[in-house]
């Protein structure tokens, strides 16, 4: 999906009002400097591409993020403020339903959410170019 035409300010507002708190809640108990920042993004569409990937694509050691509150709110924000996003996600959603639904907070998931916090932080930078 090409995130170029999203309403970035509306997504930023959704992040600041609710998604950020859910990320904080998920990370509760984690040490500040436990994980290095290794994932980056250069502009807002790129940041959303990386955020989508880390939030919804299962990775080795962390298959359970998509059912978390911050993930569901991220999905809702993208669906509302990114034209045509919902349609591209139908197949992905059906595939996800076939996976196990048990929530397990592994260290790998915490590391991944730490990277997500960094990506969202970059997305919210006031001077970050949109293209």
């Amino acid at each position: 999906y090409d995130f170029t035409n999203c309403d970035f300010e509306k997504i930023k507002a959704a992040y600041l009002s609710t998604i950020s708190k859910d990320l904080i809640t998920y990370m509760s108990g984690t040490k500040s400097t436990e994980f290095n920042n290794t994932v980056s993004c250069s502009n807002r569409p790129h940041c959303l591409t990386e955020i989508q990937s880390l939030t919804f694509n299962p990775t080795a050691g962390c298959a359970s993020l998509a059912k978390e509150m911050f993930a569901m709110k991220t999905k809702a924000a993208l669906a509302i403020w990114c034209p045509g996003y919902s349609e591209t996600q139908i197949n992905a959603t059906q595939a996800m339903k076939k996976r196990r639904k048990r929530k397990v907070t592994t260290n790998k998931c915490l590391e991944q959410v730490s990277q997500l916090q960094g990506l969202w932080r970059r997305f919210n930078r006031p001077l970050l170019k949109q293209q």
């Epitope: 950020s20 904080i24 500040s32 400097t33 994980f35 920042n37 916090q117």
Partner: antibody, heavy 118, light 107 residues
Amino acid sequence: QVQLVQSGAEVKKPGASVKVSCKASGYTFTSYLMHWVRQAPGQCLEWMGEIDPSDSYTDYNQNFRGRVTITVDMSASTAYMELSSLRSEDTAVYYCALTGTINYFDYWGQGTLVTVSS
Amino acid sequence: DIQMTQSPSFLSASVGDRVTITCKASQDVVTAVAWYQQKPGKAPKLLIYWASMRHTGVPSRFSGSGSGTEFTLTISSLQPEDFATYYCQQYSSFTFTFGCGTKLEIK
């Protein structure tokens, strides 16, 4: 182990600028955010701003915007905080401090006293 | 910005006493609160993060609790080295803000 070593005390005249340094060691410099926090005599701790050394992006407390500039020298693993248009109420101890993506401060420099006096 | 209101500003107590310091946030900060101890001429030292997690090496007599807008730091049995100034800090929202401190003095 992580260490943050700051430059020595400074005495400045009102209207001048001061530049405080913070030399980091014991970790990969680009991995974490560097913050500056100040403490005026008998006052609260006040967060001034931060820098992401990986790309030198800065965020500042609105109270200091326009007067504070935070920079890094990657080759020296050193962060700098410059405060301009100094006034007597800027007399304070200035600390550098380190965080990851979660913004509480588990590592601090030893502090640098800046005195502004005519 | 979120305001962090700490009370009391000053507290006199004796060795062995149990003391409680409170911090109120002007809006919900979930559990994103840290507590620091500062002694004269020294940098603050992290005691508690995530409202209740003790930092490495911090004695078990220090404990934190709370969520939302009300938080407490408790020292169960004061030791001579505990007389210092204590600060709370919220890291839920940018800009990151501190309480104005509680100075704990020997009675």
